[in-house]
């Protein structure tokens, strides 16, 4: 699996952001597809679970992302994106997108470095 992300994303505190992750695979996409999103905080703390998809989306039941994340992917579009709501400054960090599409299960994990800022500094602002 090859993963494509925006790598760097800047968004304003309090807004929503789409963490875009698309992929390509030598295998046709089917019900075996899984997507795992995790978060590494800036302070180097432990990696945290953000989201999991396998046929259905699975929201986190607890933790910082509870009720603040939703699936915005579409397997037919090779899209594994999520929406993160009501951004906070402590959401700053690295988000990883891992896609497995058996038998195609290898490949580099996609990363997005999210910067939550007070106001817009440049045009790479990605709402929805």
């Amino acid at each position: 699996v090859e993963i494509y992300t925006s790598r760097v994303l800047e968004a304003v505190n309090g807004t929503d952001a789409r963490l875009k992750c698309t992929f390509s695979s030598f295998a046709p996409v089917g019900d075996a597809l899984t997507v795992t999103w995790n978060f590494r905080p800036l302070d180097g703390g432990p990696e945290q679970f953000v989201f999991y998809y396998h046929i259905d989306p699975f929201q986190p039941m607890s933790g910082r992302f509870k009720d603040r994340v939703s699936w915005d992917g579409n397997p037919e579009r090779y899209d594994a994106s999520i929406l993160l709501w009501k951004l906070q400054f402590d959401d700053n960090g690295t988000y990883t997108c891992q896609v497995k599409n058996p038998p195609d299960v290898d490949g580099v994990i996609g990363e997005i470095r999210l910067s939550v800022v007070h106001t817009v500094r440049f045009s790479e602002i990605h709402f929805l």
């Epitope: 875009k20 259905d56 989306p57 929201q59 939703s70 929406l83 990605h126």
Partner: antibody, heavy 114, light 107 residues
Framework: EVKLVESGGGLVQPGGSLKLSCAAS????????MSWVRQTPEKRLEWVAY????????YYPDTVKGRFTISRDNAKNTLYLQMSSLKSEDTAMYYC???????WGQGTSVTVSS | SIVMTQTPKFLLVSAGDRVTITCKAS??????VAWYQQKPGQSPKLLIY???NRYTGVPDRFTGSGYGTDFTFTISTVQAEDLAVYFC?????????FGGGTKLEIK
């Protein structure tokens, strides 16, 4: 086969209300964000509402914000658009669309006129 | 909101011709651009997503390209059944916006 069937359109007076429905089949409805898009009599396309999976966070353009409400019932595989304080400029064909537009229904016509 | 300026508005071509439609965004939209085909009396149908990805079942005579603000949609060899209106759309930033459409007519 993915199928989206809209209903609920009709003729309504300015200031009136209407509720549109979209019955979805052929895919796992709860796993997709959903949208409403309208096409004006001049054939211009305008996105009017969007709802996420899960808790169903909603988004609207300023032209309909506060007047239109998108909602979903995953148990019934149905998407809704509640429209109130309707204006003549809301006259259009209303389509429901899966995700970011990979499938569209055939549409339901809304005419706002006195 | 982001304005998508689509040109030309009309195209009159012969079967077998190559057709190019352009869309210019008023600010960068990355590659978050889709192209739709709407045949008379039908709803829009997705042809291209993420600027250059052909959707499932779409013939390979339809191609898209571009990044940032400038996008192109091409039909390499027009066929009679391609009679339709074609729209570009950006879904990078809310509100999502569409181009004004290009009506393709066959001589």
């Amino acid at each position: 086969e993915v199928k989206l069937v809209e209903s609920g359109g009709g003729l309504v007076q300015p200031g009136g209300s209407l509720k549109l429905s979209c019955a979805a089949s052929g895919f796992t409805f709860s796993s997709y964000t959903m949208s409403w898009v309208r096409q004006t009599p001049e054939k211009r396309l305008e996105w009017v509402a969007y709802i996420t999976t899960g808790a169903g966070r909603t988004y609207y353009p300023d032209t309909v914000k506060g007047r239109f409400t998108i909602s979903r019932d995953n148990a019934k595989n149905t998407l809704y658009l509640q429209m109130s304080s309707l204006k003549s400029e809301d006259t259009a064909m209303y389509y429901c669309a899966r995700h970011r537009g990979d499938y569209w229904g055939q549409g339901t016509s809304v005419t706002v006129s006195s | 909101s982001i304005v998508m300026t689509q040109t030309p508005k009309f195209l009159l071509v012969s079967a077998g011709d190559r057709v190019t439609i352009t869309c210019k965004a008023s600010q960068s939209v990355s590659n978050d651009v889709a192209w739709y085909q709407q045949k008379p009396g039908q709803s829009p149908k997705l042809l291209i997503y993420y600027a250059s990805n052909r959707y499932t079942g779409v013939p390979d005579r339809f191609t898209g390209s571009g990044y940032g603000t400038d996008f192109t949609f091409t039909i390499s060899t027009v066929q009679a059944e391609d009679l339709a209106v074609y729209f570009c759309q950006q879904d990078y930033s809310s509100p999502w916006t569409f181009g004004g459409g290009t009506k393709l007519e066959i001589k």
